[in-house]
Interface confidence: low
């Protein structure tokens, strides 16, 4: 009598997560009588996948009817494959007994699960940085298999080269994760810029996944200040303007000081947006030129986005003509007693 053989023709089968897998197994003889069982893995810790004789296996069906006497095909169909199903599957013949006695195992079929990577998530720095500084962005994607994966970084469509990528774990696993950190040097024009992390994998059929982050969340463009004065129609008044230019983000607090003493504080409101995404703002004071005796220094002090204040000072210029318009009895505050004392626009 010919010795019974258990034949698993495929050494490996690869399927995409969510699909079904067919694992083939035939035996060369139906004698002796006894069940066929499928296991994942070998040795004492193996996991029972399908038992012809008993049990409930909702995701597993036999390809052919195993109850037919002349059927020597014990191939199975596993539906809705997940990465956790990866492993080596063995078709095993038992001889009926109490307990059943294992007679022969097939050589095993390695089931590899191709799982799509999750949508890449790009995270930026926790604190803003100023132009010319380097910031790091991290891209993570999980749950893919096989391990082979390609990750690229782009800034405004241009590929970046300064990044480091790791795929974990290093050894074999049912699924893998990728983490990449890119270093980006900020420029003043980066408020509207975007970084893109692009992940290509065999399961994506040439249509890579992308994750994005806006540099507007990572950049702080400090303002430039300019203080100047202009005459007004009323000959004893001048307009002193603080022009705050090219800053980002919007959060800005402006304080006017008269000879070092706080006279007025404003929060930036009606801002003008520049094409590059930065903002401009101006604040102005009406100054009574007759009220001063000695030189008056007006300082525009700006605290931007919680950073240390920057300031620009202006010595009030009063012409001889303006001085002539003031009577000897004039007295009072330097700032014109208008309400409000200052304005913005």
């Amino acid at each position: 009598e010919e010795e019974l053989q258990v034949i698993q023709p495929e050494k490996s089968v690869s399927v995409t997560a969510g699909e079904s897998a067919t694992l083939n197994c035939t035996v060369t003889s139906l004698i002796p009588v006894g069940p066929i069982q499928w296991f994942r893995g070998a040795g004492p810790g193996r996991e029972l996948i399908y038992n012809l004789k008993e049990g409930h296996f909702p995701r597993v069906t036999t390809v052919l009817d195993p109850t037919k006497r002349n059927n020597m095909d014990f191939s199975i169909h596993i539906s809705n494959i997940t990465p956790a199903d990866a492993g080596t599957y063995y078709c095993v013949k038992f001889r009926k007994g109490s307990p059943d006695v294992e007679l022969k195992s097939g050589a095993g079929t390695e089931l590899s699960v191709r799982a799509k990577p999750s949508a890449p998530v790009v995270s930026g720095p926790t604190a803003r940085a100023t132009p010319e500084h380097t910031v790091s962005f991290t891209c993570e994607s999980h749950g893919f298999s096989p391990r082979d994966i390609t990750l690229k970084w782009f800034k405004n469509g241009n590929e970046l080269s300064d990044f480091q990528t790791n795929v974990d774990p290093a050894g074999k696993s049912v699924s893998y994760s990728i983490r990449s950190t890119a270093r980006v040097v900020l420029t003043r024009r980066d408020v509207h810029s975007q970084v893109i992390c692009e992940v290509a994998h065999v399961t994506l059929q040439g249509d890579p996944l992308r994750g994005t982050a806006n540099l507007s969340e990572a950049i702080r463009v400090p303002p430039t200040l300019e203080v100047f004065q202009r005459p007004m129609r009323a000959e004893n008044q001048v307009n002193v303007t603080c022009q705050v230019r090219k800053f980002y983000p919007q959060r800005l607090l402006l304080t006017w000081l008269e000879n070092g003493n706080v006279s007025q504080t404003e929060t930036a409101s009606t801002l003008t947006e520049n094409k590059d995404g930065t903002y401009n703002w101006r604040s102005w004071l009406l100054v009574n030129t007759c009220a001063h005796r000695d030189g008056v220094v007006l300082t525009c002090q700006v605290e931007h986005d919680g950073q240390p204040a920057v300031s620009k000072s202006h010595a009030l210029e009063v012409s001889a003509h303006q001085k002539e318009q003031c009577s000897d009895t004039t007295s009072g505050p330097v700032l014109a007693p208008t309400a409000p004392l200052g304005g913005s626009g």
């Epitope: 082979d148 390609t150 790791n166 795929v167 290093a170 074999k172």
Partner: antibody
């Protein structure tokens, strides 16, 4: 035919540098984890470094910071840049391909001899 | 690092003999164990992966077994071309490590 051919070995003084190359044919190198393994004369095999398909790199402790593994997909080639070489680095260096699913070594090059001596 | 210990370090046998080489890992490596054959002046040749799977073209007289920490390589009937040095290797985690080798010599 699947083949790996190493080159770039030779005699170098301690502290010197050498760059080993491994030309792959018959398969796409970037689709596999690739490794360097070395063997000092009369000694056993020692794993040195690996580069994964995503460009991730790994090194044995004794070469960390001195050796750099890289690959050039356009040339289907693997490299090992060896700096600050020591006498203990003297060995035959083999380029090895890892298996597609579990990284089990399957294809070996013929090896290239590196001698570090003054 | 995972240590791999082979025994014996050397072994004398005759043509036709059945020989077994053992390899022990310092921690569980599942079945991520490979066996290699090396002849003098030649590059190693891959024989077995995942403890028991034969590489393509490797004759069936070679067999591997084991899981966890203890593994064996068996050559069922030695032929003259089988006299060589055999190495085991774990590849479950970096750094990959080899056993010190077992030199199989003709008695």
């Amino acid at each position: 035919e699947v083949q790996l051919v190493e080159s770039g070995g030779g005699l170098v003084q301690p502290g010197g540098s050498l760059r080993l190359s491994c030309a792959a044919s018959g398969f796409t190198l970037s689709s596999y984890d690739m490794h360097w393994v070395r063997q000092a004369t009369g000694k056993g095999l020692e794993w040195v470094s690996a580069i994964g398909t995503a460009g991730d790199t790994y090194y044995t402790g004794s070469v960390k910071g001195r050796f750099t593994i890289s690959r050039e997909n356009a040339k289907n080639s693997l490299y090992l840049q060896m700096n600050s070489l020591r006498a203990a680095d003297t060995a035959v260096y083999y380029c090895v391909r890892g298996g597609v699913w579990d990284d089990a070594f399957d294809i070996w090059g013929q090896g290239t001899m590196v001698t570090v001596s003054s | 690092d995972i240590q791999m210990t082979q025994s014996p370090s050397s072994l004398s046998a005759s043509v036709g003999d059945r020989v077994t080489i053992t390899c022990r890992a310092s921690q569980d490596i599942n079945n991520y164990l490979a066996w290699f054959q090396q002849k003098p002046g030649k590059a190693p040749k891959s024989l077995i992966y995942t403890a028991s799977s034969l590489h393509s073209g490797v004759p069936s007289k070679f067999s591997g077994s084991g899981s966890g920490t203890d593994f064996t390589l068996t050559i069922s009937s030695l032929q003259p071309e089988d006299f060589a040095t055999y190495y085991c290797q774990q590849y479950v985690s970096y750094p990959y490590t080899f056993g010190q080798g077992t030199k199989l010599e003709i008695k």
